[in-house]
Amino acid sequence: MMTGTIETTGNISAEKGGSIILQCHLSSTTAQVTQVNWEQQDQLLAICNADLGWHISPSFKDRVAPGPGLGLTLQSLTVNDTGEYFCIYHTYPDGTYTGRIFLEVLESSVAEHGARFQIP
């Protein structure tokens, strides 16, 4: 029986150009975590394997950093990064637990004002 629960950072927002930490935590189970997969919609961003460590998608290696812990740090955020992110915990003997995070990337108000007003 799967007794565990995943706690996530839930719905979060961040500014364009900034960075954000995506964090999930598996609790209420003694199951062994064998691998954690981080996905954005249908795209695999990163894997953290219990034995073999972190693996980052080549498409994201310049903008994704492993950690802290089993979390994932997204850097140099763009508006296109807005959307759903999933942490998928593969465990033994329980099976698979999935957590969902919604990230909204907002236009920086500083950047907007900087573009509109020029100092003569």
Epitope: Q35, L44, L52, H55, P58, K61, T96
Partner: antibody
Framework: EVQLVQSGAEVKKPGASVKVSCKAS????????IYWLRQAPGQRLEIMGR????????YFVDKFKNRATITTDTSASTAYMELSSLRSEDTAVYYC??????????WGQGTLVTVSS | DIQLTQSPSFLSASVGDRVTITCKGS??????LVWYQQKPGKAPKLLIY???NLQSGVPSRFSGSGSGTEYTLTISSLQPEDFATYYC????????FGQGTKVEIK
């Protein structure tokens, strides 16, 4: 053109150690992890471990944690795998492979290691 | 970790035949499946990644499909150079290989 070239076949006695080399060319050596895998006769390919040439950090599956050592010489773009306390069941073809994200895109040609008394 | 079982283990075929190899996972592989070709004494060669993406330089007669636990590699018209052993590999949970399918000349 990416190439991984391994050292030649070895015959070892039980209890001995073997060190296999893997020379990489055609890409920036520090930008990809190198994995070591093996295939014993009639068995499937199995992963032994990994090294990140950028920082020398190694990772091993449980089965090989106490017997395998993986190192690199970044100046020579070469990875090494040493397996100690050899036994007959270590007779296998040993491969190095470059990982690109989540899968192996280029492999060495394999090195046959025979353990026999 | 996910166990992969390929079928058949051996396959006899003729040049021009359409060949299909199946790879079944013990759990959902989530399309994180790769196919390799290996010839005797040679390094394995990447054919297909992420279930259905053809690696650069691989002939279009090779194709991959599948979802969930079942995946297939298809060679639409077998060529003399295609006689080899084929392996599937998954990375959804652990990093594991199938036992291989040897394609021999009939």
């Amino acid at each position: 053109e990416v190439q991984l070239v391994q050292s030649g076949a070895e015959v070892k006695k039980p209890g001995a150690s073997v060190k296999v080399s893997c020379k990489a060319s055609g890409y920036t050596f520090t930008e990809h992890s190198i994995y070591w895998l093996r295939q014993a006769p009639g068995q499937r390919l199995e992963i032994m471990g990994r090294i990140d040439p950028k920082n020398g950090r190694t990772y091993f599956v449980d089965k090989f944690k106490n017997r395998a050592t993986i190192t690199t010489d970044t100046s020579a773009s070469t990875a090494y795998m040493e397996l100690s306390s050899l036994r007959s069941e270590d007779t296998a073809v040993y491969y190095c492979a470059r990982i690109d994200g989540f899968y192996f895109d280029f492999w060495g040609q394999g090195t046959l290691v025979t353990v026999s008394s | 970790d996910i166990q992969l079982t390929q079928s058949p283990s051996f396959l006899s075929a003729s040049v021009g035949d359409r060949v299909t190899i199946t790879c079944k996972g013990s759990q959902n592989v989530n399309k994180y499946l790769v196919w390799y070709q290996q010839k005797p004494g040679k390094a394995p060669k990447l054919l297909i990644y992420s279930t259905d993406n053809l690696q650069s330089g691989v002939p279009s007669r090779f194709s991959g499909s599948g979802s969930g636990t079942e995946y297939t590699l298809t060679i639409s018209s077998l060529q003399p150079e295609d006689f080899a052993t084929y392996y599937c590999y998954q990375y959804n949970n652990g990093f594991t290989f199938g036992q291989g399918t040897k394609v021999e000349i009939k």
